[in-house]
Protein backbone atom coordinates (compact mmCIF):
# COMPACT_ATOMS: atom_id res chain seq x y z
CA UNK A 1 0.00 0.00 0.00
CA UNK A 2 0.92 3.68 -0.10
CA UNK A 3 2.31 5.27 3.08
CA UNK A 4 0.44 8.45 3.94
CA UNK A 5 2.26 11.11 5.97
CA UNK A 6 0.18 11.65 9.08
CA UNK A 7 -1.49 15.04 9.44
CA UNK A 8 -0.57 16.49 12.89
CA UNK A 9 -4.13 17.81 13.24
CA UNK A 10 -5.68 14.32 13.21
CA UNK A 11 -7.97 13.24 16.09
CA UNK A 12 -6.29 11.03 18.68
CA UNK A 13 -6.98 7.35 18.38
CA UNK A 14 -6.50 5.04 21.36
CA UNK A 15 -6.78 1.74 19.56
CA UNK A 16 -3.68 1.20 17.43
CA UNK A 17 -4.40 -2.50 16.81
CA UNK A 18 -6.74 -4.28 14.43
CA UNK A 19 -9.71 -4.61 14.52
CA UNK A 20 -9.27 -0.85 14.06
CA UNK A 21 -12.03 1.50 15.17
CA UNK A 22 -12.17 4.83 13.38
CA UNK A 23 -14.32 7.95 13.54
CA UNK A 24 -16.64 8.47 10.56
CA UNK A 25 -18.64 11.59 9.80
CA UNK A 26 -21.98 10.40 8.38
CA UNK A 27 -22.76 13.73 6.75
CA UNK A 28 -22.38 12.36 3.24
CA UNK A 29 -20.43 14.32 0.68
CA UNK A 30 -21.80 13.62 -2.80
CA UNK A 31 -18.93 13.52 -5.26
CA UNK A 32 -21.12 12.63 -8.24
CA UNK A 33 -20.14 15.27 -10.73
CA UNK A 34 -22.01 13.37 -13.43
CA UNK A 35 -24.77 15.72 -14.57
CA UNK A 36 -26.39 13.33 -17.04
CA UNK A 37 -29.96 13.07 -15.70
CA UNK A 38 -30.56 9.76 -17.52
CA UNK A 39 -27.78 7.71 -15.96
CA UNK A 40 -28.97 4.09 -15.79
CA UNK A 41 -32.58 5.17 -15.21
CA UNK A 42 -34.29 3.42 -18.12
CA UNK A 43 -31.59 1.01 -19.22
CA UNK A 44 -33.28 -1.79 -17.25
CA UNK A 45 -36.15 -1.71 -19.75
CA UNK A 46 -34.26 -0.91 -22.97
CA UNK A 47 -31.53 -3.50 -22.47
CA UNK A 48 -31.37 -6.71 -24.52
CA UNK A 49 -30.93 -8.30 -21.09
CA UNK A 50 -33.64 -6.39 -19.19
CA UNK A 51 -33.93 -6.50 -15.42
CA UNK A 52 -36.25 -5.57 -12.58
CA UNK A 53 -35.15 -3.72 -9.46
CA UNK A 54 -36.13 -5.09 -6.06
CA UNK A 55 -35.98 -3.09 -2.85
CA UNK A 56 -33.85 -4.68 -0.13
CA UNK A 57 -34.44 -2.99 3.23
CA UNK A 58 -32.53 -3.61 6.45
CA UNK A 59 -32.74 -1.09 9.31
CA UNK A 60 -29.56 -2.53 10.85
CA UNK A 61 -27.58 -1.51 7.75
CA UNK A 62 -26.46 1.84 6.42
CA UNK A 63 -27.66 2.55 3.79
CA UNK A 64 -30.84 0.79 4.91
CA UNK A 65 -32.26 0.54 1.37
CA UNK A 66 -30.37 -1.11 -1.49
CA UNK A 67 -31.86 -1.87 -4.91
CA UNK A 68 -31.09 -5.32 -6.32
CA UNK A 69 -31.35 -6.19 -10.02
CA UNK A 70 -32.86 -9.47 -11.17
CA UNK A 71 -32.57 -10.41 -14.85
CA UNK A 72 -36.02 -10.93 -16.37
CA UNK A 73 -35.05 -13.83 -18.60
CA UNK A 74 -32.33 -16.43 -18.96
CA UNK A 75 -32.02 -15.50 -22.65
CA UNK A 76 -31.70 -12.08 -24.32
CA UNK A 77 -34.18 -9.99 -26.28
CA UNK A 78 -33.64 -10.09 -30.05
CA UNK A 79 -34.47 -7.51 -32.72
CA UNK A 80 -38.04 -8.84 -32.97
CA UNK A 81 -38.63 -8.35 -29.23
CA UNK A 82 -38.60 -12.09 -28.51
CA UNK A 83 -36.35 -13.94 -26.09
CA UNK A 84 -33.38 -15.56 -27.85
CA UNK A 85 -32.12 -18.50 -25.82
CA UNK A 86 -28.92 -18.83 -27.85
CA UNK A 87 -27.65 -15.93 -25.74
CA UNK A 88 -27.65 -15.60 -21.94
CA UNK A 89 -28.68 -12.76 -19.67
CA UNK A 90 -26.32 -12.56 -16.69
CA UNK A 91 -26.20 -10.30 -13.63
CA UNK A 92 -23.40 -7.75 -13.29
CA UNK A 93 -22.41 -7.91 -9.65
CA UNK A 94 -20.33 -5.66 -7.48
CA UNK A 95 -18.97 -5.89 -3.97
CA UNK A 96 -19.88 -2.78 -2.02
CA UNK A 97 -19.16 -1.51 1.47
CA UNK A 98 -22.01 -0.90 3.89
CA UNK A 99 -22.13 -0.13 7.60
CA UNK A 100 -23.72 -2.73 9.89
CA UNK A 101 -24.93 -1.60 13.33
CA UNK A 102 -22.75 -3.38 15.89
CA UNK A 103 -23.79 -4.07 18.57
CA UNK A 104 -27.27 -4.39 16.98
CA UNK A 105 -29.67 -1.41 17.27
CA UNK A 106 -26.88 1.03 18.18
CA UNK A 107 -27.25 4.35 16.41
CA UNK A 108 -23.58 5.36 16.69
CA UNK A 109 -21.55 2.20 16.38
CA UNK A 110 -20.97 0.27 13.16
CA UNK A 111 -18.80 -2.33 11.52
CA UNK A 112 -17.79 -2.23 7.85
CA UNK A 113 -19.33 -5.02 5.84
CA UNK A 114 -18.82 -6.18 2.26
CA UNK A 115 -21.91 -7.32 0.39
CA UNK A 116 -22.40 -8.50 -3.16
CA UNK A 117 -25.11 -6.68 -5.07
CA UNK A 118 -26.47 -7.13 -8.56
CA UNK A 119 -26.52 -3.79 -10.39
CA UNK A 120 -27.99 -4.77 -13.76
CA UNK A 121 -27.73 -7.42 -16.44
CA UNK A 122 -25.75 -7.90 -19.63
CA UNK A 123 -26.13 -10.26 -22.57
CA UNK A 124 -23.30 -12.76 -23.09
CA UNK A 125 -22.45 -15.50 -25.55
CA UNK A 126 -22.93 -18.83 -23.73
CA UNK A 127 -20.03 -20.99 -22.67
CA UNK A 128 -20.21 -24.13 -24.78
CA UNK A 129 -19.40 -27.24 -22.75
CA UNK A 130 -17.98 -29.86 -25.09
CA UNK A 131 -18.67 -33.41 -23.96
CA UNK A 132 -15.62 -35.69 -24.51
CA UNK B 1 -37.98 5.26 8.49
CA UNK B 2 -38.05 2.37 10.95
CA UNK B 3 -37.46 3.23 14.61
CA UNK B 4 -34.82 0.98 16.18
CA UNK B 5 -34.98 0.43 19.94
CA UNK B 6 -31.60 1.49 21.33
CA UNK B 7 -29.43 -1.27 22.75
CA UNK B 8 -28.41 -0.27 26.33
CA UNK B 9 -24.92 -1.69 25.68
CA UNK B 10 -24.12 0.85 22.93
CA UNK B 11 -20.92 2.92 23.20
CA UNK B 12 -21.43 6.50 24.36
CA UNK B 13 -21.50 9.14 21.69
CA UNK B 14 -20.70 12.74 22.60
CA UNK B 15 -21.87 14.39 19.41
CA UNK B 16 -25.66 14.19 19.22
CA UNK B 17 -25.96 16.68 16.34
CA UNK B 18 -25.42 16.37 12.64
CA UNK B 19 -22.88 16.12 11.10
CA UNK B 20 -22.97 12.91 13.13
CA UNK B 21 -19.71 11.19 13.98
CA UNK B 22 -19.91 7.48 14.62
CA UNK B 23 -17.49 4.71 15.53
CA UNK B 24 -16.77 2.23 12.75
CA UNK B 25 -14.88 -1.04 13.10
CA UNK B 26 -12.81 -1.43 9.90
CA UNK B 27 -12.36 -5.17 10.38
CA UNK B 28 -14.54 -6.04 7.40
CA UNK B 29 -17.13 -8.76 7.68
CA UNK B 30 -17.73 -10.43 4.32
CA UNK B 31 -21.41 -11.27 3.95
CA UNK B 32 -21.21 -12.67 0.43
CA UNK B 33 -23.15 -15.90 0.81
CA UNK B 34 -23.64 -16.31 -2.93
CA UNK B 35 -22.04 -19.60 -3.91
CA UNK B 36 -22.08 -19.05 -7.67
CA UNK B 37 -18.36 -19.36 -8.49
CA UNK B 38 -18.64 -17.53 -11.82
CA UNK B 39 -19.82 -14.14 -10.60
CA UNK B 40 -18.97 -11.45 -13.16
CA UNK B 41 -15.44 -12.77 -13.80
CA UNK B 42 -15.45 -13.16 -17.58
CA UNK B 43 -18.62 -11.36 -18.54
CA UNK B 44 -16.67 -8.24 -19.56
CA UNK B 45 -15.28 -10.20 -22.51
CA UNK B 46 -18.26 -12.39 -23.43
CA UNK B 47 -20.82 -9.57 -23.36
CA UNK B 48 -22.37 -8.15 -26.52
CA UNK B 49 -21.46 -4.82 -24.89
CA UNK B 50 -17.91 -5.70 -23.74
CA UNK B 51 -15.96 -3.45 -21.39
CA UNK B 52 -12.47 -2.88 -20.05
CA UNK B 53 -11.71 -2.42 -16.37
CA UNK B 54 -9.59 0.54 -15.29
CA UNK B 55 -7.91 0.77 -11.91
CA UNK B 56 -8.78 3.93 -9.98
CA UNK B 57 -6.45 4.40 -7.00
CA UNK B 58 -6.74 7.06 -4.31
CA UNK B 59 -4.82 6.67 -1.03
CA UNK B 60 -7.11 9.20 0.63
CA UNK B 61 -10.09 6.91 0.05
CA UNK B 62 -11.16 3.61 1.59
CA UNK B 63 -11.21 1.33 -0.34
CA UNK B 64 -8.22 2.92 -2.06
CA UNK B 65 -8.64 0.84 -5.26
CA UNK B 66 -11.87 0.82 -7.27
CA UNK B 67 -12.23 -0.74 -10.71
CA UNK B 68 -14.14 1.32 -13.27
CA UNK B 69 -15.73 -0.19 -16.38
CA UNK B 70 -15.45 1.56 -19.74
CA UNK B 71 -17.49 0.22 -22.67
CA UNK B 72 -15.23 -0.82 -25.56
CA UNK B 73 -17.61 0.28 -28.30
CA UNK B 74 -20.47 2.70 -28.90
CA UNK B 75 -22.41 -0.11 -30.57
CA UNK B 76 -22.93 -3.77 -29.60
CA UNK B 77 -21.34 -6.94 -30.91
CA UNK B 78 -23.62 -8.87 -33.27
CA UNK B 79 -23.73 -12.61 -34.03
CA UNK B 80 -20.97 -12.20 -36.64
CA UNK B 81 -18.64 -10.61 -34.10
CA UNK B 82 -18.95 -7.17 -35.69
CA UNK B 83 -20.01 -3.93 -34.03
CA UNK B 84 -23.65 -3.10 -34.76
CA UNK B 85 -24.23 0.64 -34.43
CA UNK B 86 -28.02 0.23 -34.51
CA UNK B 87 -27.64 -0.75 -30.84
CA UNK B 88 -25.81 1.09 -28.07
CA UNK B 89 -23.36 -0.11 -25.40
CA UNK B 90 -24.00 1.87 -22.21
CA UNK B 91 -22.39 1.76 -18.76
CA UNK B 92 -24.40 0.46 -15.81
CA UNK B 93 -23.63 2.86 -13.01
CA UNK B 94 -24.09 2.59 -9.29
CA UNK B 95 -23.72 4.99 -6.41
CA UNK B 96 -21.50 3.49 -3.74
CA UNK B 97 -20.32 4.60 -0.33
CA UNK B 98 -16.62 5.07 0.34
CA UNK B 99 -14.69 6.57 3.25
CA UNK B 100 -12.68 9.74 2.56
CA UNK B 101 -9.87 10.62 4.98
CA UNK B 102 -10.85 13.86 6.70
CA UNK B 103 -8.81 15.80 7.61
CA UNK B 104 -6.58 14.58 4.74
CA UNK B 105 -3.87 12.00 5.53
CA UNK B 106 -5.48 10.99 8.84
CA UNK B 107 -5.45 7.23 9.39
CA UNK B 108 -8.38 7.18 11.86
CA UNK B 109 -10.80 9.86 10.78
CA UNK B 110 -13.08 9.64 7.75
CA UNK B 111 -16.14 11.13 6.16
CA UNK B 112 -18.70 9.09 4.21
CA UNK B 113 -18.73 9.92 0.54
CA UNK B 114 -21.01 8.86 -2.31
CA UNK B 115 -19.37 8.20 -5.65
CA UNK B 116 -20.75 7.01 -8.95
CA UNK B 117 -18.96 4.04 -10.49
CA UNK B 118 -19.48 2.15 -13.75
CA UNK B 119 -19.71 -1.56 -12.99
CA UNK B 120 -20.15 -2.99 -16.48
CA UNK B 121 -21.96 -2.37 -19.75
CA UNK B 122 -25.25 -3.47 -21.26
CA UNK B 123 -26.63 -3.32 -24.78
CA UNK B 124 -29.71 -1.13 -25.24
CA UNK B 125 -32.04 -0.20 -28.05
CA UNK B 126 -31.32 3.44 -28.93
CA UNK B 127 -33.79 6.21 -28.17
CA UNK B 128 -34.96 7.49 -31.53
CA UNK B 129 -35.43 11.27 -31.53
CA UNK B 130 -37.97 12.24 -34.20
CA UNK B 131 -37.29 15.63 -35.74
CA UNK B 132 -40.48 17.66 -36.16
Amino acid sequence: GITIPRNPGCPNSEDKNFPRTVMVNLNIHNRNTNTNPKRSSDYYNRSTSPWNLHRNEDPERYPSVIWEAKCRHLGCINADGNVDYHMNSVPIQQEILVLRREPPHCPNSFRLEKILVSVGCTCVTPIVHHVA
Amino acid sequence: GITIPRNPGCPNSEDKNFPRTVMVNLNIHNRNTNTNPKRSSDYYNRSTSPWNLHRNEDPERYPSVIWEAKCRHLGCINADGNVDYHMNSVPIQQEILVLRREPPHCPNSFRLEKILVSVGCTCVTPIVHHVA
Partner: antibody, heavy 124, light 113 residues
Framework: QVQLQESGPGLVKPSETLSLTCTVS????????VSWIRQPPGKGLEWIGI???????DYNSAFKSRVTISVDTSKNQFSLKLSSVTAADTAVYYC??????????????????WGQGTLVTVSS | DIVMTQSPLSLPVTPGEPASISCKSS????????????LAWYLQKPGQSPQLLIY???TRQSGVPDRFSGSGSGTDFTLKISRVEAEDVGVYYC?????????FGQGTKVEIK
Amino acid sequence: QVQLQESGPGLVKPSETLSLTCTVSGFSLPSHSVSWIRQPPGKGLEWIGIIWNQGGTDYNSAFKSRVTISVDTSKNQFSLKLSSVTAADTAVYYCARNAYITDYYYENYFFDAWGQGTLVTVSS
Amino acid sequence: DIVMTQSPLSLPVTPGEPASISCKSSQSLLFSENQKNYLAWYLQKPGQSPQLLIYWTSTRQSGVPDRFSGSGSGTDFTLKISRVEAEDVGVYYCQQSYYTPYTFGQGTKVEIK
Protein backbone atom coordinates in the same frame (compact mmCIF):
# COMPACT_ATOMS: atom_id res chain seq x y z
CA GLN C 1 -49.87 -15.29 5.97
CA VAL C 2 -49.68 -15.05 2.17
CA GLN C 3 -53.09 -14.99 0.50
CA LEU C 4 -54.32 -14.46 -3.06
CA GLN C 5 -58.02 -14.30 -3.90
CA GLU C 6 -59.50 -14.16 -7.40
CA SER C 7 -62.87 -12.55 -8.07
CA GLY C 8 -65.00 -11.67 -11.08
CA PRO C 9 -68.04 -12.77 -13.07
CA GLY C 10 -68.48 -16.51 -13.46
CA LEU C 11 -70.23 -16.15 -16.81
CA VAL C 12 -69.03 -14.17 -19.84
CA LYS C 13 -70.65 -14.01 -23.28
CA PRO C 14 -68.64 -14.96 -26.40
CA SER C 15 -66.77 -12.02 -28.02
CA GLU C 16 -66.91 -10.04 -24.75
CA THR C 17 -64.05 -9.28 -22.36
CA LEU C 18 -63.30 -11.45 -19.34
CA SER C 19 -62.23 -9.30 -16.35
CA LEU C 20 -60.83 -10.77 -13.15
CA THR C 21 -59.26 -9.26 -10.04
CA CYS C 22 -56.71 -10.81 -7.71
CA THR C 23 -56.54 -9.31 -4.21
CA VAL C 24 -53.39 -10.15 -2.30
CA SER C 25 -52.23 -9.87 1.30
CA GLY C 26 -49.31 -11.01 3.43
CA PHE C 27 -46.55 -9.92 1.05
CA SER C 28 -45.07 -6.78 -0.43
CA LEU C 29 -46.19 -5.92 -3.95
CA PRO C 30 -42.98 -4.03 -4.78
CA SER C 31 -40.98 -7.20 -4.12
CA HIS C 32 -43.04 -9.81 -5.90
CA SER C 33 -44.27 -10.49 -9.40
CA VAL C 34 -47.63 -12.14 -10.03
CA SER C 35 -48.75 -14.44 -12.86
CA TRP C 36 -52.13 -15.55 -14.18
CA ILE C 37 -52.54 -19.24 -15.00
CA ARG C 38 -55.64 -21.08 -16.21
CA GLN C 39 -56.90 -24.64 -16.20
CA PRO C 40 -59.67 -25.67 -18.62
CA PRO C 41 -62.07 -28.29 -17.15
CA GLY C 42 -60.34 -31.68 -16.89
CA LYS C 43 -57.17 -30.33 -18.51
CA GLY C 44 -53.69 -29.14 -17.57
CA LEU C 45 -52.31 -25.76 -16.54
CA GLU C 46 -51.54 -22.92 -18.94
CA TRP C 47 -49.49 -19.80 -18.11
CA ILE C 48 -51.16 -16.63 -19.42
CA GLY C 49 -48.74 -13.91 -18.38
CA ILE C 50 -46.95 -11.99 -15.65
CA ILE C 51 -46.79 -8.53 -14.19
CA TRP C 52 -43.38 -7.85 -12.67
CA ASN C 53 -42.83 -6.00 -9.42
CA GLN C 54 -41.99 -2.78 -11.32
CA GLY C 55 -45.14 -2.95 -13.44
CA GLY C 56 -43.76 -4.38 -16.69
CA THR C 57 -45.58 -7.30 -18.28
CA ASP C 58 -44.84 -10.39 -20.36
CA TYR C 59 -47.51 -12.50 -21.99
CA ASN C 60 -47.82 -15.96 -23.48
CA SER C 61 -47.78 -15.30 -27.25
CA ALA C 62 -50.89 -17.48 -27.55
CA PHE C 63 -52.82 -14.69 -25.77
CA LYS C 64 -50.65 -11.65 -26.57
CA SER C 65 -53.07 -9.79 -28.83
CA ARG C 66 -56.00 -9.98 -26.39
CA VAL C 67 -54.58 -10.04 -22.84
CA THR C 68 -53.80 -7.19 -20.45
CA ILE C 69 -52.48 -7.61 -16.90
CA SER C 70 -52.30 -4.57 -14.63
CA VAL C 71 -51.82 -3.66 -10.97
CA ASP C 72 -53.38 -1.19 -8.53
CA THR C 73 -50.80 -1.04 -5.75
CA SER C 74 -52.98 1.15 -3.52
CA LYS C 75 -55.61 -1.62 -3.40
CA ASN C 76 -53.17 -4.57 -3.41
CA GLN C 77 -54.95 -5.80 -6.52
CA PHE C 78 -53.91 -7.29 -9.84
CA SER C 79 -56.27 -7.58 -12.77
CA LEU C 80 -56.56 -9.76 -15.85
CA LYS C 81 -58.49 -8.73 -18.97
CA LEU C 82 -58.96 -11.19 -21.82
CA SER C 83 -60.84 -9.83 -24.83
CA SER C 84 -62.82 -11.54 -27.61
CA VAL C 85 -63.44 -14.69 -25.55
CA THR C 86 -64.76 -17.94 -26.98
CA ALA C 87 -65.94 -21.20 -25.40
CA ALA C 88 -62.28 -22.36 -25.48
CA ASP C 89 -61.54 -19.74 -22.78
CA THR C 90 -63.78 -21.54 -20.28
CA ALA C 91 -61.45 -22.44 -17.40
CA VAL C 92 -60.56 -22.03 -13.76
CA TYR C 93 -58.37 -18.90 -13.61
CA TYR C 94 -55.67 -18.66 -10.94
CA CYS C 95 -53.44 -15.81 -9.88
CA ALA C 96 -50.15 -17.04 -8.46
CA ARG C 97 -47.14 -15.40 -6.85
CA ASN C 98 -43.81 -15.85 -8.59
CA ALA C 99 -41.29 -17.11 -6.04
CA TYR C 100 -38.79 -14.54 -4.76
CA ILE C 101 -35.40 -15.83 -3.70
CA THR C 102 -32.82 -13.59 -2.03
CA ASP C 103 -29.23 -13.79 -3.33
CA TYR C 104 -30.49 -15.18 -6.62
CA TYR C 105 -30.24 -12.75 -9.49
CA TYR C 106 -33.00 -13.83 -11.86
CA GLU C 107 -36.75 -13.49 -11.80
CA ASN C 108 -38.38 -16.83 -10.99
CA TYR C 109 -41.11 -18.37 -13.11
CA PHE C 110 -42.31 -20.98 -10.66
CA PHE C 111 -45.12 -20.21 -8.26
CA ASP C 112 -45.02 -20.53 -4.48
CA ALA C 113 -48.52 -19.28 -3.59
CA TRP C 114 -51.78 -19.63 -5.51
CA GLY C 115 -55.29 -18.27 -5.22
CA GLN C 116 -58.14 -20.73 -4.82
CA GLY C 117 -59.14 -20.16 -8.48
CA THR C 118 -62.33 -18.90 -10.04
CA LEU C 119 -64.31 -20.72 -12.72
CA VAL C 120 -65.21 -18.58 -15.74
CA THR C 121 -67.66 -20.05 -18.23
CA VAL C 122 -67.94 -18.52 -21.69
CA SER C 123 -71.44 -19.09 -22.99
CA SER C 124 -74.30 -17.14 -24.52
CA ASP D 1 -43.32 -23.77 -27.11
CA ILE D 2 -41.54 -26.31 -24.92
CA VAL D 3 -43.49 -29.53 -24.58
CA MET D 4 -43.41 -31.26 -21.19
CA THR D 5 -44.35 -34.95 -21.29
CA GLN D 6 -45.18 -36.82 -18.10
CA SER D 7 -45.48 -40.55 -17.55
CA PRO D 8 -47.40 -42.40 -16.41
CA LEU D 9 -50.62 -40.39 -16.68
CA SER D 10 -52.17 -42.51 -13.95
CA LEU D 11 -50.32 -44.09 -11.02
CA PRO D 12 -52.09 -46.41 -8.54
CA VAL D 13 -50.02 -46.59 -5.35
CA THR D 14 -49.92 -48.55 -2.11
CA PRO D 15 -49.41 -46.52 1.09
CA GLY D 16 -45.89 -47.04 2.45
CA GLU D 17 -44.55 -48.02 -0.98
CA PRO D 18 -42.34 -45.79 -3.17
CA ALA D 19 -43.65 -44.02 -6.28
CA SER D 20 -41.93 -42.36 -9.21
CA ILE D 21 -43.09 -39.95 -11.94
CA SER D 22 -41.12 -39.10 -15.07
CA CYS D 23 -41.08 -35.76 -16.90
CA LYS D 24 -39.37 -35.14 -20.23
CA SER D 25 -38.77 -31.75 -21.80
CA SER D 26 -38.55 -31.09 -25.56
CA GLN D 27 -35.46 -28.91 -24.90
CA SER D 28 -32.74 -28.88 -22.28
CA LEU D 29 -33.60 -27.00 -19.10
CA LEU D 30 -29.98 -26.70 -17.99
CA PHE D 31 -28.70 -23.10 -17.87
CA SER D 32 -24.99 -23.04 -18.66
CA GLU D 33 -24.21 -19.96 -16.54
CA ASN D 34 -25.18 -21.46 -13.19
CA GLN D 35 -25.67 -25.18 -13.96
CA LYS D 36 -29.23 -25.07 -12.63
CA ASN D 37 -32.04 -27.07 -14.24
CA TYR D 38 -35.21 -25.02 -14.39
CA LEU D 39 -37.80 -27.61 -13.53
CA ALA D 40 -40.47 -27.46 -10.82
CA TRP D 41 -43.00 -29.96 -9.47
CA TYR D 42 -46.48 -29.22 -8.09
CA LEU D 43 -49.19 -31.29 -6.42
CA GLN D 44 -52.83 -30.41 -6.95
CA LYS D 45 -54.89 -32.17 -4.32
CA PRO D 46 -58.57 -32.85 -5.11
CA GLY D 47 -60.57 -29.60 -5.04
CA GLN D 48 -57.50 -27.47 -4.28
CA SER D 49 -55.04 -25.18 -6.06
CA PRO D 50 -51.62 -26.50 -7.07
CA GLN D 51 -48.90 -26.29 -4.41
CA LEU D 52 -45.18 -26.02 -5.12
CA LEU D 53 -43.21 -29.08 -4.03
CA ILE D 54 -39.81 -28.73 -5.69
CA TYR D 55 -37.99 -26.16 -7.82
CA TRP D 56 -34.64 -26.14 -9.65
CA THR D 57 -35.11 -29.90 -10.08
CA SER D 58 -34.22 -30.90 -6.53
CA THR D 59 -34.74 -28.00 -4.09
CA ARG D 60 -37.66 -28.75 -1.77
CA GLN D 61 -39.99 -25.88 -1.05
CA SER D 62 -40.20 -24.91 2.62
CA GLY D 63 -42.59 -27.20 4.52
CA VAL D 64 -42.53 -30.03 1.96
CA PRO D 65 -41.84 -33.43 3.58
CA ASP D 66 -38.47 -35.00 2.81
CA ARG D 67 -40.13 -38.09 1.38
CA PHE D 68 -40.42 -36.00 -1.82
CA SER D 69 -37.25 -35.72 -3.89
CA GLY D 70 -36.45 -34.57 -7.40
CA SER D 71 -33.62 -35.50 -9.73
CA GLY D 72 -32.52 -35.28 -13.36
CA SER D 73 -30.78 -32.92 -15.74
CA GLY D 74 -31.14 -31.57 -19.25
CA THR D 75 -34.36 -33.09 -20.60
CA ASP D 76 -35.11 -36.03 -18.25
CA PHE D 77 -36.45 -35.53 -14.74
CA THR D 78 -37.98 -37.66 -12.00
CA LEU D 79 -40.07 -36.99 -8.91
CA LYS D 80 -39.84 -39.71 -6.26
CA ILE D 81 -41.97 -40.29 -3.18
CA SER D 82 -40.03 -42.61 -0.88
CA ARG D 83 -43.09 -43.85 1.06
CA VAL D 84 -46.49 -42.77 -0.21
CA GLU D 85 -49.00 -41.50 2.35
CA ALA D 86 -52.75 -41.17 1.89
CA GLU D 87 -52.45 -37.35 1.80
CA ASP D 88 -50.18 -37.53 -1.27
CA VAL D 89 -53.04 -38.32 -3.66
CA GLY D 90 -53.81 -35.83 -6.38
CA VAL D 91 -52.43 -34.70 -9.73
CA TYR D 92 -48.70 -34.01 -10.01
CA TYR D 93 -47.47 -31.51 -12.60
CA CYS D 94 -43.96 -30.75 -13.77
CA GLN D 95 -43.27 -27.25 -15.11
CA GLN D 96 -40.33 -25.71 -16.94
CA SER D 97 -39.35 -22.22 -15.83
CA TYR D 98 -36.60 -21.65 -18.42
CA TYR D 99 -38.35 -20.70 -21.66
CA THR D 100 -41.26 -18.34 -22.18
CA PRO D 101 -44.09 -19.30 -22.33
CA TYR D 102 -43.60 -21.33 -19.15
CA THR D 103 -45.27 -24.69 -19.74
CA PHE D 104 -46.61 -27.55 -17.62
CA GLY D 105 -46.80 -31.28 -18.17
CA GLN D 106 -50.24 -32.82 -18.70
CA GLY D 107 -50.29 -34.18 -15.14
CA THR D 108 -49.99 -37.58 -13.43
CA LYS D 109 -52.92 -38.71 -11.31
CA VAL D 110 -51.76 -40.53 -8.18
CA GLU D 111 -54.43 -42.55 -6.41
CA ILE D 112 -54.49 -45.21 -3.70
CA LYS D 113 -54.94 -48.77 -4.99
